[in-house]
Interface confidence: low
């Protein structure tokens, strides 16, 4: 109610004579802070002095503390809150009751504490879960009601006496609710453990040895079983017997059933310790193991593997990898059952034996075509030899071999001709499926591995072609090698290097690019006149009458080709000069009279100049001089001269006659 | 003059997959195949593939089947390479080439760089 | 399937000198070899196919030979322009089309 002080502690404290006690412990006063602390040893309230009497183990006042034996109390509170208090070290006669008389300046409290103390270190207490089972794990727990700040202790587990590997974790508690040291093992039982000590020993801090408790572990688990077997390899041949017998060597709780099985599988009707095999075959081969069960479950033995012997069965091969491809590597297992395995193999390729060839195995590192065929083995083991089973079929796949491109046509080839070519093979696998052609025209094929090339061009010069199944094989390539008429036939002027004039030497050139067969003959023409046969056409001393149009013709087996006309052009000074008279040489006086220069020049006459009789320039210079009105004075012989580029000609004199006209006649 | 124009760079991400396109022109497209050939950092040419322009007719690395795909399109000029289910090797330059016995055209080349 | 097998992997080469670049296949090739060259950051470049044969605007010092399972590259001045990595590469069989895995021609 309102009127008590209200205190929190432990209600007993328990240790041992020459340890420590610590007792943890809170209080709030009714009204104000705590003024008088006395701790008394078994107080007893005296009615006449209305005070308490008893052993004062611990005092303090408002004046200060009175010292306590050899402070061997220790008051560890304060004045509103915290009573906790230590004895250090705690005897015998320390048990019983403490009273903790409490004053403020108004109230009083005693409030009664239980301190056991015994003459030996008490042991700690093993709590066990209610079953055990092997190899399910458990907590084992050891406790003990004492924790001191002052005395540290420890708990050590022990299994037969010997520390025990586990981890254990140790936990201690000195609170008002409760003071004790704990310790946890998590520890997974097996079926050995049954029956087995287990200790949990209290030490002090240095390792000796305080006290203990022991437990005796009962560890529930199935029936843990022995298997003999007679004969003890439990090798035998078909016909042999076999006895197998099944001990029991620990089971809790007690087994209640026995069975055998074979392989996993459980053995009908045989539900004795003894299994009994009479005339075995080697079928009867395999794991045998006997099962026993009690309430946790069953147990098993472990497996005998028995060994039925017997000749080797008819063997299969079995390929690594078909098909297989050419070069690539190839392994054969020869698979026979047998026991024991077989020692011994002999191989077979097509029927016939494979020398050198005795191993389970047999690689080939390099596979070529001829490797194709059908592979059987047989197998051999010391009870006798097997028989040669179907065999398997190794496939070996390689390119096309030996691919060759091959002209149909008649040779040779002409430019222009439908060129048939096929491309051939001498061997595949798998079969050609398609073939390339290089270079990759936009060509006709007709037929598989057939090229038709229409109107074959004259620089159409090798072909390849590949045949292809998985991979293509390239044929060396053919030159078609085709045949044409010369190409590109040009005239060429050798010399003169510069423009030809008349008297020059001259040399002309029929040049062409190229022409198969190389074999040519040349034709020079001028005006359809066949001028010579040579691939030059020389001129010592050109002439006029030289120049004109030109061409060359070059022909081979295949066809000819002429040049484009090539004109001839020669620059010489004006020549045949004449003067001609219009409209005659004897003109009446008073007309007109015109004197026309007539030349033959190259480059044509750029400049003109007239002559008289007396050789007098005229003060004319165009190709005409025009007289009029014409005078008989004008009568006389003239002359003109022409000039070009290349140099000057002259004419002869021509004689105009002037005659009087009739009017002047008839005047004189 | 003949030409082979590759697309440009592409960066990627494992798994992913990219298409490179390599455009022809200066002779006629159909009557020359395509090869592809790849080049890794510092590493040796390695032959990809081949497709005739003329039938479409394609021949792949084994070592590429089932991730290469190699087209053309005959009204564009063009042909395309696509490699699926990208790795960080096939980080490499690409290229397009003109195919003949005689002489060849490479593209520039396109970086393909694959990287988580 | 087929393995070309390049040697030397490097080769030290002044300018001016002879190099020679061997590829030996697994099988026989026939004469289906070609060779290519390859500078940093280009495509690579053919130089020789059918085993001898220039290709289009290849310099005449570049000159192929061999046959059947043994082949040469021989380059016959190198030029500055020559430093670069070879590769041989087989079209006999395939797929796959294989290549050598290269012989690097570097400055001496």
């Known amino acids: 109610d309102s009127s008590k002080w209200v205190f929190e502690h432990p209600e007993t404290l328990y240790a041992w004579e020459g340890a420590c006690v610590w007792i943890p412990c809170t209080y709030r006063a009714l009204d104000g802070d705590l003024e008088s602390f006395i701790l008394f040893h078994n107080p007893e309230y005296n009615k006449n002095t209305s005070k308490f009497d008893g052993t004062r183990l611990y005092e303090s006042t408002k004046d200060g503390k009175v010292p306590s034996e050899q402070k061997r109390v220790q008051f560890l509170g304060d004045k509103n809150k915290n009573c906790t208090l230590s004895i250090h070290p705690v005897h015998l006669n320390d048990s019983g009751q403490l009273g903790l008389r409490m004053e403020s300046k108004t109230e009083k409290w005693m409030e009664r504490i239980h301190l056991n103390v015994s003459e030996r270190p008490f042991p700690p207490h093993i709590q066990l879960p209610p079953e055990i089972q092997e190899s399910q794990e458990v907590t084992l727990t050891c406790l003990l009601n004492f924790s001191c700040y002052g005395y540290p202790i420890q708990l050590q587990w022990l299994l037969e006496g010997v520390p025990m590997r586990q981890a254990a974790v140790t936990s201690t508690s000195l609170t008002i609710k409760s003071v004790f040291t704990r310790s946890e093992l998590k520890f997974s039982p097996q079926w050995s453990h049954h029956g087995k000590i287990v200790t949990c020993q209290l030490q002090d801090a240095d390792g000796k040895f305080l006290s203990n408790d022991t437990v005796q572990l009962n560890v529930k688990h199935t029936p843990k079983l022995e298997i003999k077997v007679t004969p003890s390899d439990a090798i035998v041949r078909e016909g042999d017997s076999v006895t197998m017998t099944c001990e029991v060597s620990s089971s809790n709780p007690e087994y209640t059933t026995v069975s055998w099985l074979k392989d996993g599988t459980s053995l009908k009707k045989q539900n004795t310790f003894t299994l009994n095999l009479r005339e075995v075959t080697k079928d009867q081969s395999g794991k045998y193991c006997c099962q026993v069960s009690n309430d946790v479950g069953p147990g098993r033995s472990e497996e005998v593997f028995l060994q039925v012997q017997y000749a080797p069965e008819p063997s299969t091969v079995q390929i690594l990898h078909s098909p297989a491809v050419e070069g690539s590597q190839v392994e054969f297992l020869c698979m026979s059952l047998a026991n024991p395995l077989p020692t011994n193999y002999t191989w077979y390729h097509n029927g016939k034996e494979m020398q050198g060839r005795t191993e389970e195995k047999v690689h080939i590192p390099k596979i070529l075509p001829w490797h194709a065929g059908t592979y059987s083995c047989v197998a051999e083991n010391i009870l006798g030899t097997g028989q040669r089973g179907p065999g398997a079929e190794l496939d070996v796949q390689y390119p096309p071999k030996k691919v060759t491109t091959v002209i149909q046509n008649p040779m040779p080839i002409r430019e222009g001709d439908t060129v048939t070519l096929s491309c051939n093979y001498n061997s595949s696998n798998p079969s050609v499926t398609r073939y390339e052609w290089k270079p990759h025209g936009a060509w006709e094929e007709p037929s598989l591995g057939v090229l038709k090339i229409q109107n074959v061009g004259w620089d159409n010069t090798t072909i390849a072609c590949a045949a292809c199944n998985s991979w293509c094989s390239w044929a060396s390539p053919v030159a078609l090698n085709v045949q044409y008429a010369p190409r590109d036939v040009r005239v060429r002027k050798i010399k003169p290097l510069s423009e030809i004039h008349s008297g020059n030497s001259v040399s002309l050139q029929c040049d062409f690019s190229s022409s198969h067969p190389k074999e040519v003959q040349f034709f020079w023409e001028k005006n359809g006149r066949l001028l010579g046969k040579e691939s030059q056409l020389n001129f010592d001393s050109i002439s006029p009458e030289d120049a004109g149009s030109y061409s060359c013709w070059v022909n081979n087996s295949i066809g000819q080709t002429a040049s484009k006309a090539w004109t001839l052009e020669v620059l010489y000074a004006p020549r045949r000069l004449r003067v001609s008279m219009s409209p005659g040489d004897q003109v009446m006086e008073g007309k007109s009279a015109t004197l026309t220069c007539e030349s033959d020049a190259n480059p044509p006459v750029s400049h003109y100049t007239w002559f008289d009789w007396n050789n007098q320039s005229l003060p004319y210079h165009s190709q005409k001089l025009r007289l009029e009105p014409v005078k008989v004075q004008h009568s006389g012989a003239y002359w003109c001269q022409g000039t070009n580029s290349v140099g000057k000609g002259r004419s002869p004199l021509s004689t105009l006659t002037v005659y009087y006209s009739p009017e002047t006649i008839g005047r004189r | 003059q003949v030409q082979l124009v590759q697309s440009g760079a592409e960066v990627k991400k494992p798994g992913a997959s990219v298409k490179v396109s390599c455009k022809a022109s200066?002779?006629?497209?159909?009557?020359?195949?395509i090869t592809w050939v790849r080049q890794a950092p510092g590493q040796c040419l390695e032959w990809m593939g081949w497709?005739?322009?003329?039938?479409?007719?394609?021949i792949y690395a084994q070592k590429l089947q089932g991730r290469v795909t190699m087209t053309t399109d005959t009204s564009t000029s063009t042909a395309y390479m696509e490699l699926r289910s990208l790795r960080s090797d096939d980080t490499a330059v690409y290229y397009c080439?003109?195919?003949?016995?005689?002489?060849?055209?490479w593209g520039q080349g396109t970086l393909v760089t694959v990287s988580s | 399937e087929i393995v070309l097998t390049q040697s030397p992997a490097t080769l030290s080469v002044s300018p001016g000198e002879r190099a020679t670049l061997s590829c030996r296949a697994s099988?026989?090739?026939?004469?289906?070899l070609a060779w290519y060259q390859q500078k940093p950051g280009q495509a690579p470049r053919l130089l020789i196919y059918?085993?001898?044969t220039r290709a289009t605007g290849i310099p005449a010092r570049f000159s192929g030979s061999g046959s059947g399972t043994e082949f040469t590259l021989t380059i016959s001045s190198l030029q500055s322009e020559d430093f670069a990595v070879y590769y041989c590469?087989?079209?006999?069989?395939?797929?796959?089309?294989?290549f050598g895995c290269g012989t690097k021609v570097e400055i001496k």
């Open positions: 080439v003109r195919d003949s016995n005689h002489e060849d055209f």
């Open positions: 200066g002779y006629s497209f159909t009557s020359y195949g």
């Open positions: 497709i005739s322009a003329y039938n479409g007719n394609t």
């Open positions: 099988q026989s090739v026939s004469s289906n």
């Open positions: 059918g085993a001898s």
């Open positions: 590469q087989q079209y006999h069989t395939w797929p796959p089309v294989t």
